[in-house]
Interface confidence: low
């Protein structure tokens, strides 16, 4: 098949692959009918004039993971059929003007993971058919006005992981077909009003891991097709009242890792499609009535690791489709009995690592589908009679690391726990904290006769009586907090991966799906 360089492999499908450290220049002669050429992991440092002159049928050219630092302006001459060009993972600092001239069919241009210091309007002025431009992982400090003006067909632009400190409001104005814009991991402190106004078809906007302190009220008002908005790990301390008002298609919004102190009613929405709202690691202290009431399709609400001490009874109004509610690691002391009343489809709730002293008997009254409840590491001494009776699907209940008061009032709870031991898991069981003579003993098998009797007459338990168990040897109370944690780590180079990870067998509330961007 028309000759294949010895350092390359050539398939009958006109695909050529050249790899290896011994390659220091573009191999020759390349088969004239090659349609795909990959030059990977070589020691090529420069591309000279027209090394691909005789393979004009080439459609895809990948020159990746090399030592490439210099390219002659005419390097890609005669590649008029080229649709895909990747120069990613090289050592390019400068692109010569006119490098992409004549590449009239080019649709994808990957320049990511180089050391580019600047781009100019003239670089891409000939690339009128370009649909994808990847510039992430470079050293760009600013984007000049006009840089993308000729790329009217562009649908995906990645500028993440650069050193951008500001963006001109005009730089994206001609990109009316853009669907994905990624600006994550830069040094942006604010985004001027109007920056995204021309992006009427935008579906994903990634702004996470910048230093944005303030969002302009109308920043997203023209982006009616936006589906994913990543604002996590910035310095946002407040949300303007109308900032999310015109996002009817949004289905994922990440705001974790900011400095939000309060959420005002109506701030979210109306967003008929929003499925996930990530708000952990902020400074939120209270949740007012109706704060999420516009989010009728919300399924995942993560509010953990804030400073929430008060939740208004109507805070979760409207969240009829919510499946997962994470409130762990906050400062809750009390909960209103009606606070979860509207959450008819809730399956998992995490309330661990708070300061809850008691729970109202009707707290889970309407939430019949609950499968997992995390209540460990609170200040609970007892629980109301029958609090879990109606929860037929409950398969996971964590109650350890609470100061259970094992007097005769604890009997109904102890009997219920005895019958439902599998739901408690085998790792850590709840133990008595008081009276002193039973401290450290398992709540489930404690002999309540040994404990100090309560002054009140206990109610008749609604659970069947269970046999008494003799005393068991005391063992130290384990006070280590084994809390559910949300970890964030990048997936590929543009993602908010938000995995709620579990440290024991709490896999149901482990939110096994990775929330990736």
């Amino acid at each position: 098949y028309h000759g294949c360089p010895s350092e390359c492999t050539c398939s009958r499908a006109s695909q050529v692959e050249c790899t290896g450290a011994r390659i220091v220049a573009v191999p020759t002669p390349l088969p004239w009918n090659a349609m795909s050429l990959q030059i990977l992991n070589t020691h090529i440092t420069e591309l000279n004039e027209s090394p691909f002159l005789n393979i004009s049928a080439l459609i895809a050219l990948r020159i990746e993971k090399n030592e490439l630092s210099r390219i002659t302006p005419g390097a890609f001459r005669n590649l008029g059929s080229l649709r895909y060009l990747s120069l990613a993972n090289n050592k390019l600092q400068v692109l010569p003007i006119g490098l992409f001239q004549g590449l009239d069919s080019l649709e994808s241009l990957l320049l990511s993971s180089n050391q580019l210091l600047q781009i100019q309007p003239a670089h891409f002025s000939q690339c009128s058919n370009l649909k994808e431009l990847q510039l992430h992982g470079n050293h760009l400090e600013y984007i000049p006005d006009g840089a993308f003006d000729h790329l009217v067909g562009l649908t995906k632009l990645n500028l993440g992981k650069n050193s951008l400190t500001h963006i001109s409001p005009r730089v994206f104005q001609h990109l009316g077909n853009l669907q994905v814009l990624r600006l994550y991991e830069n040094r942006l402190t604010d985004i001027p009003m109007g920056t995204f106004d021309g992006l009427v078809n935008l579906q994903e906007l990634a702004l996470q891991q910048n230093q944005i302190g303030l969002l302009s009220p109308g920043l997203f008002h023209n982006n009616h097709n936006l589906q994913r908005l990543y604002l996590s790990n910035n310095h946002i301390s407040q949300l303007p009242p109308s900032v999310f008002m015109q996002l009817p298609q949004l289905n994922r919004l990440t705001l974790f890792g900011n400095s939000l102190k309060e959420l005002s009613p109506g701030i979210f929405g109306p967003m008929p499609n929003l499925r996930e709202l990530w708000l952990y690691d902020n400074h939120i202290s209270s949740l007012p009535d109706n704060v999420f009431s516009n989010l009728r399709q919300l399924q995942v609400l993560i509010l953990s690791r804030n400073q929430i001490s008060f939740i208004s009874p109507g805070a979760f109004n409207g969240l009829t489709e919510l499946r997962e509610l994470s409130l762990h690691t906050n400062a809750l002391q009390d909960l209103d009995g009606n606070v979860f009343r509207m959450l008819a489809n809730l399956q998992n709730i995490s309330l661990q690592n708070n300061r809850l002293r008691q729970l109202p008997g009707n707290i889970f009254a309407n939430v019949n589908g609950l499968m997992a409840i995390q209540l460990q590491n609170n200040q609970l001494e007892n629980l109301p009679l029958g609090i879990f009776d109606h929860l037929g699907k409950l398969c996971e209940l964590r109650l350890y690391d609470n100061p259970w008061r094992c007097d005769s009032d604890i009997l109904p709870l102890r009997n219920w726990l005895l019958l439902n031991q599998p739901r408690l898991g085998t790792d850590t069981v709840p133990v008595c904290f008081s009276p002193a003579n039973v401290r450290g003993q398992s709540l489930i098998i404690i002999n309540v006769n040994v404990a100090v009797p309560s002054v009140h007459v206990p109610e008749v338990p609604s659970y069947p009586e269970t046999p008494w168990y003799p005393d068991t040897p005391s063992y130290p109370d384990t006070t280590s907090v084994s809390s559910t944690t949300e970890l964030t780590s990048p997936v590929e180079d543009y993602t908010d991966l938000t995995t709620i990870q579990v440290t024991d067998d709490r896999s149901v509330w482990g939110m096994t799906q990775a929330q990736s961007g």
């Epitope: 109308g218 008002h221 009616h224 009817p248 008929p272």
Partner: antibody, heavy 119, light 111 residues
Framework: QVQLVQSGAEVKKPGSSVKVSCKAS????????ISWVRQAPGQGLEWMGG????????NYAQKFQGRVTITADESTSTAYMELSSLRSEDTAVYYC????????????WGQGTLVTVSS | QSALTQPASVSGSPGQSITISCTGT?????????VSWYQQHPGKAPKLMIY???NRPSGVSNRFSGSKSGNTASLTISGLQAEDEADYYC???????????FGGGTKLTVL
């Protein structure tokens, strides 16, 4: 009680423009959305576009894009709909309607303005 | 042609129940719980009867109820009365170029 009062009937020549007003009273004007819906004689309802005065950015149905302009004046609690390049098939009753949000439902309607396009 | 499909007419006798259907796609009716129903008497502006599939605004009789299954929404009027005779329109939020789509309307005749 919320009320939407529209301007009076208009007769226009083909190719000209018409501007219909809708004055709101009895509620917060800025934070609600005003939509414009038209109804040709003997026909159904057709959404043209909407605006939330607080934001100022209108949204238009694709069919009317480029021909309709919707604006709002917060100081007078009045919304406007201007339709240009009129043709005979634009003869219709034009309603303004208020909703919590232009995507959802319209709980208050104006009385309607008949626009007749005839040469 | 309207984006949502309704029967052109339905009829019923006083006291009876009738149902008007409204069929769309997964981009409108099927995709969201944002279906509304309006009643319109001749020469009058439409009046909101049902919003968000099944909610009734205050002042609307509980004889009017709404539901949805898949891509089809329905309006049911029980205990038909003479004043129910009117045109009825369904409307949905739409994941398309138009944010709002209406049905073609159904003329209800009370016999």
């Amino acid at each position: 009680q919320v009320q939407l009062v529209q301007s009076g009937a208009e007769v226009k020549k083909p190719g000209s423009s018409v501007k219909v007003s809708c004055k709101a009273s009895g509620g917060t004007f800025s934070t609600y959305a005003i939509s414009w819906v038209r109804q040709a004689p003997g026909q159904g309802l057709e959404w043209m576009g909407g605006i939330t005065p607080m934001f100022g950015t209108p949204n238009y149905a694709q069919k009317f894009q480029g021909r309709v302009t919707i604006t709002a004046d917060e100081s007078t609690s009045t919304a406007y709909m201007e339709l240009s390049s009129l043709r005979s098939e634009d003869t219709a009753v034009y309603y303004c309607a208020r909703g919590d949000w232009y995507d959802y439902h319209f709980d208050y309607w104006g009385q309607g303005t008949l626009v007749t396009v005839s040469s | 042609q309207s984006a949502l499909t309704q029967p052109a007419s339905v009829s019923g006798s006083p006291g009876q129940s009738i149902t008007i259907s409204c069929t769309g796609t997964s981009s409108d009716v099927g995709g969201y719980n944002y279906v509304s129903w309006y009643q319109q008497h001749p020469g009058k502006a439409p009046k909101l009867m049902i919003y968000e599939v099944s909610n009734r605004p205050s002042g609307v009789s509980n004889r009017f109820s709404g539901s949805k299954s898949g891509n089809t929404a329905s309006l049911t009027i029980s205990g038909l009365q003479a004043e129910d005779e009117a045109d009825y329109y369904c409307q949905s939020y739409a994941n398309r170029d138009n944010f709002v789509v209406f049905g073609g309307g159904t003329k209800l005749t009370v016999l």
